[in-house]
């Protein structure tokens, strides 16, 4: 058992153009109040019961009268928390709907009139006993800022409020295997009653009636040692009980996804992709139809033709997920190159580039060939965030602006003489050698090592190197 607590911080116009008109006026003063509805993400009830985890209504806020000509400010809020008590375990995953209502206080016949100003919804994961979680949700032009938490009511403790605490029997310490109950240090965790027959050495439980096995043990009561054949495919740490490597559990081992859901390992845990008609962390919530309003954030629900397609949510721009419950972060497309920082501004994606890079996606290396000319017919070659010029014959230097002496590197072999030429260099070969760089010896019988000298060219003639 425990309490879900919701603290509304502000309700007012969201950022961007199109500020909403104030809901109240001098002629029609009004005040706000809020309603919260919770559904468990891990309960069969969620589809049938609108608020299976519970609902709560806030007190009325202070009366507000619009100042003429002024834009709608953040509106005055009711005092205090909205509290939704839950009787059983906290489900860990839950759906919420928070509605902002306006109560008009004019001269209505028959009392005040109520109208819904805004509704936001979402699905979240939350451990009981954790800190306040902050959230911002938009509904049209309005923005709601709030915090929420789930806390257990004594004697319950733990992330699901399923462990129990009892006053200490001994003043100094708790019994064997039992921890003090933080924050109630003067109390101890009450022993859980595991499934009957669950091995006290190799099994444990986190909820009454279950039997979970320590590594190296298996079976419904954790009495069967894991087969040594598992040493063939080691995955995890060594087990002292079997003396060999026992596969550590992968998050998808045994497929935690129900109802035909498929399990994908993620860096942190696992994710179930559910068949249509099922949702929840493990696809255990079923029987949902469009009548249950499963699409959040203005998603359009379309009924499917067969049981596998009970419904599908067509999400408005900016939302995704089976139930349009996730805000699309287009930065998850990884659009920015070269270490650029991605910003999803809603109307557009922006990449903030690191020094030395530019372009909408930081794809241009400012040290690269873009806008960088190599002189005298040289070509620019990119590489490693820098650029260099591959110069035409006869030119050198960083930008090929310096006239090079083609003979400086002594390119003519076997004592050939080098002559600079407008199109390159010419080698005049010593007797007995031929080739563009005098690299081929002429055979004593006068035949060359090459198939034939080009017509009109005798071995020993100067040869131009192009």
């Amino acid at each position: 058992a425990g309490v879900f607590e919701l603290q509304i911080h502000s309700f007012g116009p969201g950022p961007g153009p199109g500020a909403p008109r104030s809901p109240c006026s001098a002629r029609l003063p009004c005040r706000l109040f809020f309603r919260v509805c919770l559904k468990p993400g891990l309960s069969e009830e969620a589809a049938e019961s609108p608020c299976a985890l519970g609902a709560a209504l806030s007190a009325r806020g202070p009366v507000y009268t619009e100042q003429p000509g002024a834009p709608a400010p953040d509106l005055p809020l009711p005092d205090g928390l909205l509290q939704v008590p839950f009787r059983d375990a906290w489900p860990g995953t839950f759906s919420f709907i928070i509605e902002t209502w306006r109560e008009e206080l004019g001269d209505q016949i028959g009392g005040p009139a109520w109208s819904l100003l805004a509704r936001v919804a979402g699905r979240r994961r939350l451990a009981a006993g954790g800190p306040w979680a902050r959230d911002i949700q938009r509904a049209g032009a309005w923005e709601l800022r709030f915090s929420y938490r789930a806390r257990c009511e004594p004697p319950a403790v733990g992330t699901a409020c399923t462990r129990l605490c009892r006053p200490r029997s001994a003043p100094s310490r708790c019994g064997p295997g039992l921890r003090p109950c933080a924050p109630l240090e003067d109390e101890c965790e009450a022993p859980l009653v595991c499934r009957a027959g669950c091995s006290p050495e190799h099994g444990f439980c986190e909820q009454p009636g279950e039997c979970r096995c320590l590594e190296g043990w298996t079976g419904p009561l954790c009495t069967v040692p894991v087969s040594t054949s598992s040493c063939l495919s080691p995955r995890g740490p060594s087990s002292a009980t079997t003396g060999c490597l026992v596969p550590g559990p992968g998050p998808c081992d045994g497929n935690p996804c129900a109802n035909g859901g498929s399990c994908s390992e993620t860096p942190r845990s696992f994710e179930c992709t559910c068949p249509r008609g099922f949702y929840g962390l493990r696809c255990e919530v079923s029987g949902v139809t469009c009548a249950d309003g499963p699409c959040f954030n203005g998603g359009l629900c379309v009924g499917g033709a067969d049981p596998d397609s009970a419904y599908i949510c067509h999400c408005p721009p900016g939302f995704q997920g089976s139930n349009c419950e996730k805000r699309v972060d287009r930065c998850s497309l990884q659009p920015c190159r070269n270490g650029g920082l991605c910003l999803d501004l809603g109307h557009a994606l922006r990449c903030r580039c690191r020094a030395g890079f530019a372009g909408p996606r930081c794809e241009h290396d400012l040290d690269d060939c873009a806008g960088r000319a190599c002189a005298n017919g040289g070509t620019c070659v990119e590489g490693g965030g820098a650029h260099r010029c591959s110069c035409a014959l006869g030119f050198g230097g960083r930008d090929c602006r310096e006239r090079a002496d083609p003979c400086a590197a002594r390119p003519c072999a076997h004592g050939g003489r080098c002559y600079a030429h407008f199109s390159g260099l010419v080698c005049a070969c010593a007797p007995g050698y031929m080739g563009a760089r005098c690299e081929f010896p002429v055979h004593p019988d006068g035949a060359s090592a090459l198939p034939a000298a080009p017509p009109g060219l005798r071995p020993g003639d100067p040869q131009r190197y192009l």
Epitope: S264, E271, P317, Q334, R361
Partner: antibody, heavy 117, light 107 residues
Framework: QIQLVQSGPELKKPGETVKISCKAS????????MHWVKQAPGKGLKWMGW????????GYADDFKGRFAFSLETSASTAYLQINNLKNEDTATYFC??????????WGQGTSVTVSS | DIQMTQTTSSLSASLGDRVTISCRAS??????LNWYQQKPDGTVKLLIY???RLHSGVPSRFSGSGSGTDYSLTISNLELEDIATYFC?????????FGGGTKLEIK
């Protein structure tokens, strides 16, 4: 050079599951999101969604919510597409493609999946 | 969703011809318009991205232009190896969408 190599053709029965792989090489796998595209026989290309290769978070187009799952094996520079409870209309060629910020610059050769009883 | 329409589903041209393939979007999408080529063997390659940028290794006879909702791909001097189906795709708004394709054949 940059390459995306996909697993071979698959012949499956309705109701079965198929898992297609796309192995990337020639670049840092986690720097670029991986996208999946479907092409039914004689039809055009249809974008299915993507997976962020850094976080493993997938995003699905509306028509591919439910029975389709994108996943990764980062250590092997491999992306996967799994289709559960196969139907005849899943018969198609499936492509993986690397997104470079503007477009899908590099594509796998495609994997043909045939669903027939 | 943004609808992409390639009104010409097939096109016949002669070698050496200048060929233009058009694509219309149902709404403006900030020049995030790409062109892909699918060869008869099924392989898909990017040709043009961001309306007019030539992908590396693509011959310069391919070019792209357009803005707002109307875009086009031009092949300035048709070669035999250009026989393929060409698809436009918008990459601005999710979900990304493709045109129906234009199949290019030799007369």
């Amino acid at each position: 050079q940059i390459q995306l190599v996909q697993s071979g053709p698959e012949l499956k029965k309705p109701g079965e599951t198929v898992k297609i792989s796309c192995k990337a090489s020639g670049y840092t796998f986690t720097d670029y999101s991986m996208h999946w595209v479907k092409q039914a026989p004689g039809k055009g290309l249809k974008w299915m969604g993507w997976i962020n290769t850094e976080t493993g978070e997938p995003g699905y187009a509306d028509d591919f919510k439910g029975r389709f799952a994108f996943s990764l094996e980062t250590s092997a520079s491999t992306a996967y597409l799994q289709i559960n409870n196969l139907k005849n209309e899943d018969t198609a060629t499936y492509f993986c493609a690397r997104y470079d910020g503007y477009a899908m610059h590099y594509w796998g050769q495609g994997t043909s999946v045939t669903v027939s009883s | 969703d943004i609808q992409m329409t390639q009104t010409t589903s097939s096109l016949s041209a002669s070698l050496g011809d200048r060929v233009t393939i058009s694509c219309r979007a149902s709404q403006d999408h900030s020049n995030y318009l790409n062109w892909y080529q699918q060869k008869p063997d099924g392989t898909v390659k990017l040709l043009i991205y961001y309306t007019s940028r030539l992908h590396s290794g693509v011959p310069s006879r391919f070019s792209g232009s357009g803005s707002g909702t109307d875009y086009s791909l031009t092949i300035s001097n048709l070669e035999l190896e250009d026989i393929a189906t060409y698809f436009c795709q918008q990459g601005d708004m999710l979900p990304w969408t493709f045109g129906g394709g234009t199949k290019l054949e030799i007369k």
